[in-house]
Every structure is written in C-alpha cells, then in structure tokens.
C-alpha cells in the first residue's frame, strides 16, 4: 500500500509558532510499541500455493538495520498435486514501509525518514490475460 | 515480518562523543524516495484465490496518516469454480512497519517513532491442522 | 487485552436446543475469522465451529455438522451457535475466540479465554 506524500506540513509547526530551525526537528528516544511482534502462522512462505522466499538486506545505518524482501518461486501457483499450475499466476504483495537513515560526521549525528519498498509475501491470482490456455 | 529491538544504541552517539541532550534526536525534514510508489498487479485483492477488504485507519498526528489493514474474507479459498474450498486456509500475511507520531504542547512539538503491525493481504495455504474433513 | 463474554448455556434434555452467543470487545484490525471451541471434563479443547466476519461463510467440525449453526452480526461484534439435537456428548463449557489466522490457528497461538459458557446435556 502507498504512502502518500507528506507535504511537510505534517512536520511543520503550527503558523502561529516559529518556524523549525535549521530544517530539523525533534526526534524522541525509544519506540512505541516496540514489544509488538508479528504472529503469522507458521512457514506460509512454503505452504502457500505462491509460495516465496527471503533475502535479508542488512545495512547498520539504517533502522531497522534488516529489512527482508521475499521473493515468489513461481510464476504459477501450486495445485493439490505439488505441481506448478501456469494458468494461475503468483504475485508479489507489496508494502511502503519507513526507516531511519543515520547520517553522521563525527560526533554531529543526523536521522532521516527513507520509504522502503517490501514485498511481504506473495498470493496466486486469478490473471488477467491468459498468455497460455 | 519482526522488526529487531533497537537496544538504544542505533540512535547513541559513538561514545567517544558528548550524549544527545534531553533524550531527544536531531530529525531532518524530508523523506529519501519519498516518490517512490508500490507497483502491484491491479485488484489482486479481488483476484487472489485468498482474497481480502481493506480498511483504512487515519489518525491525523500519524505519519502517515492513512494505515490500511487487510482482512481475508475467507476461511478457506477459492478454488477454480469460484467456491470456497475449505480444504485449505486462508491467512493473513503481516508486516511490522513503522510510523511516526507526532505529540504537540502548543508550539513545542517533537516526534516519536512507533511500531505498527499491519495486514498487508491474504495467501492460501495447505493446512496443519484439519478441522474439517 | 480482547474480552470475550459467552453466554446462553444451560441444562438441557438430549434433542433439546440452545443458542449460545458471544461478544467480543474489540476486534484486531485484521482479525477475520471467530471461532467456537469446547472442553470436555478431562478432555483437551476442541473446535467445533468458525465463521468469516466479511464472506460469513462457516465451517464445522464433524461431530456438530448438521446439527449446529454458526452465525454473526457485525455490528455488535456478537457472534452466535444454535445447537439443535443435543447430544450428551455435547455436554462441555463452549468457549468463543478470535481465529487471527483463520482456519490456520492452533490451540498454541491463544494466550487468553473468556469464562465461557455451561452446556449441560442429560439423557
């Protein structure tokens, strides 16, 4: 799903306030919520009838530090007999998500937001042209 | 996907450095690849053989503001007749994204990161446990 | 914390009915599916019925097919079993729950339960 474009005025002061100075604001320590942990069935990503797989990207100046990409196996879906069905088609779903970029020279440490796009999973679909009867 | 524990130590600085005032982070304006856009299939919600709604969250002191959750619509999936097979599941695929919240006090403002467990869509999976024959 | 209040059960005679009905408080974003569950004195929890709060479609474990039916209303967040042709092997304490993975949800991935509700059926 997209995230729309913020416009900065979601960063910006109220009119009747001064203005942020130097372009930056304040960013608070710690993170809400940040107990919440994903609870996903087990091993969807080889049960699935589009089934996928994962690349970790790893990058320690941007938080999260690992973003997982997954990546679908098959152009088909899976049918009940463990073959690949190529009249249906495996589709990636996608995310924008955000990360913390740190930019530091020397001891002067900066953040700045970065939209990332996931692909999460993936789904079989019915298509949309059939290429192959 | 699980975003790791941040332990504090991604938004220290290095500790040959004077510690960051307050417990508060310098926060540049502007978002890197803030044009980037999601490019999926069209309706795969629809189209998905686990398909799924979404529904939209807006809290106006969140960044971004719109969350959207997917729900499956159903418990099994639907096979090449267009009936629900409930010989196999329909789950959700998550995705732990983060937000930024936003705490105003007249023209004092700050930022905070928050986790947010969202729902991204829906896959089809072979079952681990049959409920039903 | 999700609360789930059941109720509606009883004592019954075997053949009787009972329409038991469950409440939850807050629904997960992508929660998308409730379920039915009982135990048994002695006996280990079981499914016996869920339902799809968007498709409504229900599904049933065999020992109930035919004879219980699941049913919602969105919006009061309630979710109801009509048990017809009671069985004293029906007799348990039926329990309501969010499925958050639908069909796919085990006994594992529940950390809470409401009181549940009573259903005594004698011969």
């Known amino acids: 799903r997209k995230i729309p474009k913020v416009g900065h005025t979601f960063f910006q002061k109220p009119e009747s306030c001064p203005p942020v100075p130097g372009g930056s604001m304040k960013l608070d320590i710690g993170i809400i919520n940040e107990n919440q942990r994903v609870s996903m069935s087990r091993n969807i990503e080889s049960r699935s009838t589009s089934p996928w797989n994962y690349t970790v990207t790893w990058d320690p100046n941007r938080y999260p530090s690992e973003v997982v990409q997954a990546q679908c196996r098959n152009l088909g879906c899976i049918n009940a007999q463990g073959k690949e069905d190529i009249s249906m088609n495996s589709v990636p779903i996608q995310q924008e998500t955000l990360v913390v970029r740190r930019k530091h020279q020397g001891c002067s440490v900066s953040f700045q937001l970065e939209k990332v796009l996931v692909t999460v999973g993936c789904t079989c679909v019915t298509p949309v042209i059939h290429h192959v009867q | 996907r699980k975003i790791p524990k941040v332990g504090h130590t991604f938004f220290q600085k290095p500790e040959s450095c004077p510690p960051v005032p307050g417990g508060s982070m310098k926060l540049d304006i502007g978002i890197i690849n803030e044009n980037q856009r999601v490019s999926m299939s069209r309706n795969i919600e629809s189209r998905s053989t686990s398909p799924w709604n979404y529904t939209v969250t807006w809290d106006p002191n969140r960044y971004p503001s719109e969350v959207v959750q997917a729900q499956c619509r159903n418990l099994g999936c639907i096979n090449a007749q267009g009936k629900e097979d409930i010989s196999m599941n329909s789950v959700p695929i998550q995705q732990e994204t983060l937000v930024v919240r936003r705490k105003h006090q007249g023209c004092s403002v700050s930022f905070q990161l928050e986790k947010v467990l969202v729902t991204v869509g829906c896959t089809c999976v072979t079952p681990v446990i049959h409920h039903v024959q | 914390q999700v609360q789930l209040v059941e109720s509606g059960g009883g004592l019954v005679q075997a053949g009787g009915s009972l329409n038991l009905s469950c409440v939850i408080s807050?629904?997960?974003?992508?929660?998308?599916?409730m379920g039915w569950f009982r135990q048994a004195s002695g006996k280990e929890r079981e499914f016996v019925a869920a339902?799809?709060?968007?498709?409504?479609?229900?599904v049933y474990a065999d020992s109930v097919k035919g004879r219980f039916t699941m049913s919602r209303d969105n919006a009061k967040n309630t979710v109801y079993l009509q048990m017809n042709s009671l069985k004293p092997e029906d007799t348990a304490v039926y329990y309501c729950?969010?499925?958050?993975?639908?069909?796919?949800?085990?006994?594992?991935?529940?950390?809470?339960w409401g009181q549940g509700t009573q259903v005594t059926v004698s011969s």
């Open positions: 729950n969010d499925m958050p993975y639908g069909l796919d949800t085990t006994m594992d991935d529940y950390d809470y």
């Open positions: 339902i799809s709060w968007i498709g409504g479609g229900a």
């Open positions: 807050r629904r997960t974003p992508s929660g998308y599916a």
